[in-house]
Amino acid sequence: FGISGRHSITVTTVASAGNIGEDGILSCTFEPDIKLSDIVIQWLKEGVLGLVHEFKEGKDELSEQDEMFRGRTAVFADQVIVGNASLRLKNVQLTDAGTYKCYIITSKGKGNANLEYKTGAFSMPEVNVDYNASSETLRCEAPRWFPQPTVVWASQVDQGANFSEVSNTSFELNSENVTMKVVSVLYNVTINNTYSCMIENDIAKATGDIKVTESEIKRRSHLQLLNSKA
């Protein structure tokens, strides 16, 4: 490789979050090169001495890959030529959190950018009417969260009202002993109103809405990652 190291290319990363047990993406783009064989992508993680991933001469080169990432990483090989160096991380672990460096070498020069990767668990809540309860009650359930989130109820009619006195939230550890199931119950619900169950930790914020009328029930859920420009 005849790169003097004195020319720099632009490399851009985006902070992101990974959901434990699922696949995640560490985003990185760079000024593309015309020849795939001239592009080298190296992913490094702070505190890890081996490489997270290496791609060169059009294929993965994993001889120096650190054990903690073995069999869990891949780049989008067909997109490298257009400047996509993003890394797919399979089966995200809690310990994958940290600072990563996307390091690129091309015939034009070299460049790098760091990104913060957070890991946790987050899931969409579902709000239902609890017909088993003695009074009109709503039940908000989300199967996987970590770290432990806060749960806040809100209502369209009673905007700004504090529902903490008329709600009860519990956290149940899931079988893998990391993530938890979130269950929150709201009592004394009035009809013809829209209620929102908002679950939030430092990684994600999720909202489950339910509109209860005499004739129908409408539900809507939304999940947003925090501190991520994705």
Partner: antibody, heavy 121, light 107 residues
Framework: EVQLLESGGGLVQPGGSLRLSCAAS????????MHWVRQAPGKGLEWVSA????????YYADSVKGRFTISRDISKNTLYLQMNSLRAEDTAVYYC??????????????WGQGTTVTVSS | DIQMTQSPSSLSASVGDRVTITCRAS??????LAWYQQKPGKAPKLLIY???NLATGVPSRFSGSGSGTDFTLTISSLQPEDFATYYC?????????FGGGTKVEIK
């Protein structure tokens, strides 16, 4: 002042054991990977072992694998090298060194003064 | 393991001379290369890291170049305190191999 101070060297018989210590000061110990490097009398530098900042990953030269164990005690800011089944060819000055850079791609920027290990009957 | 070969193994030079030491890796190490200076009875001292970057407090007469497999350490004008042994070392592979060293002696 950033400093590394080795201790624990000495004379030991072949087959014997020794534990080297390296006391670190002046920097955040648990954010830096650390190394042991040795130098036999009149010879060049030979990398021996490395440990990540958290202590979760360890690496060894083939010549010491299975006999030496690197570890670190973050509460004591100390790096260790447990050396078992020592051989005459392990005779050397042993240095501990700090790895420069957050990602392990740079050189060793801080070195201790060295401690001498002599394996002889 | 990646082998690092330094040349020459020793050289004689005078104060004020321009000195060049080369280091060749058995496979690419990109720019993951460092240079050290060691004086008798002392610990090594980092001179250059990432092939071309001068370590803190190192005089500007020292410079590094190269990438891939071929690297050079240059001392532009040799000073009396520069007579020592110089080592290259790769950190691409987690075997952190050193070159055999180059001893710079007074002519």
């Amino acid at each position: 002042e950033v400093q590394l101070l080795e201790s624990g060297g000495g004379l030991v018989q072949p087959g014997g054991s020794l534990r080297l210590s390296c006391a670190a000061s002046g920097f955040t110990f648990n954010t830096h990977a650390m190394h042991w490097v040795r130098q036999a009398p009149g010879k060049g530098l030979e990398w021996v072992s490395a440990i990540s900042g958290s202590g979760g990953s360890t690496y060894y030269a083939d010549s010491v694998k299975g006999r030496f164990t690197i570890s670190r005690d973050i509460s004591k800011n100390t790096l260790y090298l447990q050396m078992n089944s020592l051989r005459a060819e392990d005779t050397a000055v042993y240095y501990c060194a700090r790895l420069l850079g957050r990602f392990g791609e740079y050189g060793m920027d801080v070195w201790g003064q060295g401690t001498t290990v002599t394996v002889s009957s | 393991d990646i082998q690092m070969t330094q040349s020459p193994s020793s050289l004689s030079a005078s104060v004020g001379d321009r000195v060049t030491i080369t280091c060749r890796a058995s496979q690419t190490v990109y720019t993951w290369l460092a240079w050290y200076q060691q004086k008798p009875g002392k610990a090594p001292k980092l001179l250059i890291y990432d092939a071309t970057n001068l370590a803190t407090g190192v005089p500007s007469r020292f410079s590094g170049s190269g990438s891939g497999t071929d690297f050079t350490l240059t001392i532009s004008s040799l000073q009396p305190e520069d007579f020592a042994t110089y080592y290259c070392q790769q950190s691409y592979s987690t075997s952190w191999t050193f070159g055999g060293g180059t001893k710079v002696e007074i002519k």
